[in-house]
């Protein structure tokens, strides 16, 4: 025998108080699948959260974070404070990157400047708190009589040492 509730579509629930007829979800609730015996309460995006997508009878609301914060976790379960470029979030709030490190985003940690000399190159543009150094040609390439065009260095994936 087929369950009469299986005929109730998304956006409704099977109302046991009314002979199992399909009733629409009440305001501020939803059912995303058919055959539901209850509707779920819509998520409310308040405080540090703001509404990215309104709740409908068939889908929950979706939140993101208010300005000055960014989402953490699936479905934006929490919000983390933004910092300025050139800073990182510490236990005591946003702090400037130490000398020799940079952060070009509003989140994440300060990372060390690239060490150009490891690739046999010279520093073309100095690093700042917000920007990495720019490496230029190797010192040998700048010596008198050296060719002005140098072949590109072989591409290397981050985290992989050269073969």
């Amino acid at each position: 025998l087929q369950d009469p509730c299986s005929n109730c579509p998304a956006g409704t629930f099977c109302d046991n108080n009314r002979n199992q007829i399909c009733s629409p979800c009440p305001p501020n609730s939803f059912s995303s699948a058919g055959g539901q015996r209850t509707c779920d309460i819509c998520r409310q995006c308040k405080g540090v959260f703001r509404t990215r997508k309104e709740c409908s009878s068939t889908s929950n609301a979706e939140c993101d974070c208010t300005p000055g914060f960014h989402c953490l976790g699936a479905g934006c379960s929490m919000c983390e404070q933004d910092c300025k470029q050139g800073q990182e979030l510490t236990k005591k709030g946003c702090k400037d990157c130490c000398f020799g490190t940079f952060n070009d985003q509003k989140r994440g940690i300060c990372r060390p400047w690239t060490n150009c000399s490891l690739d046999g190159k010279s520093v073309l543009v100095n690093g700042t708190k917000e920007r990495d150094v720019v490496c230029g040609p190797s010192p040998a390439d700048l010596s008198p009589g050296a060719s002005s065009v140098t072949p590109p260095a072989p591409a290397r994936e981050p985290g992989h040492s050269p073969q």
Epitope: S77, M78, Q81
Partner: nanobody
Framework: EVQLVESGGGLVQPGGSLRLSCAAS????????MGWVRQAPGKGREFVSA????????YYADSVKGRFTISRDNSKNTLYLQMNSLRAEDTAVYYC?????????????????????WGQGTQVTVSS
Amino acid sequence: EVQLVESGGGLVQPGGSLRLSCAASGFTFSSYAMGWVRQAPGKGREFVSAISGYGGSTYYADSVKGRFTISRDNSKNTLYLQMNSLRAEDTAVYYCAAGSGLYSSYGVSTDPSFYDYWGQGTQVTVSS
């Protein structure tokens, strides 16, 4: 047994200051995000402020921004709310709340369903 015990409430004149404390026990305090929530007579709950487990991220409701400061001392398992320039509309019962999740060391939440534990509250009355 988990306990959150608020203290520091009382009667204060408009423009005055109070410092609320919330002493926590029975759980790993530093891995929990914490929040202060208030409820005025006949009104709904309002999230006043929240702080991440490490203390790096802080949130303030617009109504208290620039006047209230949230902080925590993980070595003392205590949450604080420094309230300055108090107004009559700050009169309410103030509750502290603790919630744990994958990102609670770094993030904050103002969703009441996130918080696992709630204190009994402390009354703050601002009146001349």
